[in-house]
């Protein structure tokens, strides 16, 4: 990182760990400037699975990323690729420090560390940077909705972040869907959760200084009866070559017995959609399963024809949930750029 | 406006159960987390015990856990706090109050007796 | 378990005057903190949480301040009918933990 005044006139600091992923502490305001490995060609960055443009305030330009004055919506997970292979050459993730403070000359030099910035941070145990944000600490929601439990902290050494649940380690494998551990935003985030993730959930902060937790309640409200509830994001938006092989996946919670079916969106005469407003399908399967466990819909050797939206829908006898993705087929010879290609996937999620 | 009433309070010799109630009014009961507090004569206030909405998560004080049981029921707005096996030391007002998002007990019953006397 | 501890344990004041209460946290439990007021007879009554939120229909003069291990309640004005025992409580973390009360009484 470097502090400048003229971003045009300024080097660029190269990854200090190529292909490893690097966290950097960015002080408010200030400029940023980093280039993707010894050479500029070839070279494209990304913010959270999105190419940055060439022109603005943020921009990937020449194979560096600068970003003229570091804001907190800039924190986050930026990845370098280098265009031919995809390779990753650097995965980063951007930080905001706003604990930066002034240093008097009278104070002891063996609590202070200095940054490539030029900055000097105090050394500090960790803090919670938002506790407002934390003040919701007894959370009841309905099955089937997301969680998300933050404790937004900071400190130098940057501490790292852990959760427990009911006093245990917890990674989420053992929940259907697992979890999601967002180390930037310091959060917890649990989809389509049940009665069985009900519970104390605690993050513990620590660095070499010290530690602190917090912790929340979640309680989970049953929706007797409910139509099934689906995993958020499967299926997922999903990419595959010509010939090879792909598996989609739907992940239901019900109660009632339900049924699954997949489908997949065709066009009749030129039109989507039929004289009733509903999209024109082909029932691909049809499958009862157990209340969690997983369906998959398993297409081989995939062609060009195979492309186009495919929906899961789950029924019981209350009601209907569907969720829907798309499948883009390429040719050969695009595979090398696109399969890695780190594009933020949508995904439909219906209920009726 | 929240109401929260609580009854079946009364004298008890050691040794002994009574089932206190708390009846909600005013409020979504079925979105709120309830707590059970005592105040033995002349002391402060001592958390006993909570309950989930669902009633699917409990806790306890260390002093009752064991003895008493905290439960709930929806349909007819109520909390409920079964206590067994009683001790002199249980002798206390109890109060039941409603717990905002945040824990705090924004909402308090007027209190019920218990007397546990030989 | 946190412990609170609340100065002094009672306190005698004229009305009008100013009333400054104290609760200490043996750890941090950074602004969550709540305060109650108790009548003779009556049960408690929120008066602050988040360490300085007034709770709903409870007059200015009530005020709180304070995070981490620190906190203070001050009434400003005493009125007659704020003569009572105040309690401090901490929910950051379980089991929560109540002072054991200052005396607010009439001098």
């Known amino acids: 990182l470097e502090a400048s005044e003229e971003m045009e006139q300024e080097p660029c600091l190269a990854p200090i760990l190529e292909q490893q992923e690097q966290v950097l502490t960015v002080a408010l305001g200030q400029p940023v400037r980093l280039c993707c490995g010894r050479t500029e060609r070839g070279r494209h960055w990304y913010k959270e699975g999105s190419r940055l443009a060439s022109a603005g305030r943020v921009r990937g330009w020449r194979g560096r990323l600068e970003i003229a004055s570091f804001l907190p919506e800039d924190a986050g997970r930026y990845l370098c690729l280098a265009r031919g292979s995809m390779t990753v050459v650097h995965n980063l993730t951007l930080l905001m420090d706003d604990s930066l403070t002034s240093i008097s000359n009278d104070e002891d030099p063996k609590t202070l560390s200095s940054s490539s910035s030029g900055h000097v941070y105090p050394q500090q145990a960790p803090y919670w940077t938002h506790p407002q944000r934390m003040e919701k600490k007894l959370h009841a929601v309905p099955a089937g909705n997301t969680v998300k439990f933050r404790c937004p902290a900071a400190g130098n050494p940057m501490p790292t972040i852990h959760w427990l649940k009911d006093g245990q380690a917890f990674h989420g494998e053992n929940r259907i869907g697992g979890i999601r551990l967002r180390h930037q935003h310091w959060s917890l985030v649990m989809e389509s959760v049940v009665p069985s993730d009900r519970g104390t959930y605690t993050c513990l902060v620590e660095n070499s200084l010290g530690s602190i937790r917090y912790s929340y309640l979640l309680d989970v409200l049953e929706r007797s009866p409910h139509r099934p509830i689906l995993q958020a994001g499967l299926p997922a938006n999903t990419t595959a070559v010509v010939g090879s092989d792909v598996e989609l996946l739907c992940k239901v919670y019900s109660d009632a017995q339900p049924h699954i079916q997949w489908l997949k969106h065709v066009v009749i005469n030129g039109s989507s959609f039929g004289a009733d407003g509903f999209p024109y399908v082909q029932v691909l399967k049809t499958t009862d399963i157990n209340s969690s466990e997983v369906e998959v819909l398993y297409l081989r050797n995939v062609s060009a024809e195979d492309a186009g939206e495919y929906t899961c829908l789950a029924g019981n006898s209350i009601g209907l949930s569907y969720q829907s993705a798309w499948l883009t087929v390429l040719p050969e010879e695009d595979l090398t750029w696109t399969t890695a290609t780190p594009e933020a996937a949508s995904h439909h999620h219906h209920h009726h | 406006e929240v109401q929260l009433l609580e009854s079946g309070g009364g004298l008890v010799q050691p040794g002994g159960s009574l089932r206190l109630s708390c009846a909600a009014s005013g409020f979504t009961f079925s979105r709120y987390f309830m707590k059970w507090v005592r105040q033995a004569p002349g002391k402060g206030l001592e958390w006993v015990s909570w309950?989930?909405?669902?009633?699917?998560?409990?806790e306890y004080a260390d002093s009752v856990k064991g003895r008493f049981t905290i439960s709930r029921d929806n349909s007819k707005n109520t909390l409920y706090l079964q206590m067994n096996s009683l001790r002199a030391e249980d002798t206390a007002v109890y109060y039941c109050?409603?717990?905002?998002?945040?824990?705090?007990?924004?909402?308090w019953g007027q209190g019920t007796l218990v007397t546990v006397s030989s | 378990d946190i412990q609170m501890t609340q100065s002094p344990s009672s306190l005698s004041l004229s009305p009008g005057e100013r009333a400054t209460l104290s609760c200490r946290a043996s750890q941090s439990i950074n602004r969550n903190l709540g305060w109650y007021q108790q009548k003779p007879g009556q049960a408690p009554r929120l008066l602050i949480y988040g360490a300085s939120t007034r709770a709903t229909g409870i007059p200015a003069r009530f005020t709180g301040s304070g995070s981490g291990t620190e906190f203070s309640l001050t009434i400003s004005s005493l009125q007659s009918e704020d003569y009572a025992i105040y309690y401090c409580?901490?929910?950051?973390?379980?089991?929560?933990?109540f002072g054991q009360g200052t005396r607010l009484e009439i001098k």
């Open positions: 109050a409603r717990a905002s998002y945040g824990a705090w007990l924004d909402y």
């Open positions: 309950i989930s909405p669902s009633g699917g998560l409990t």
């Open positions: 409580q901490q929910y950051d973390n379980w089991p929560i933990i």
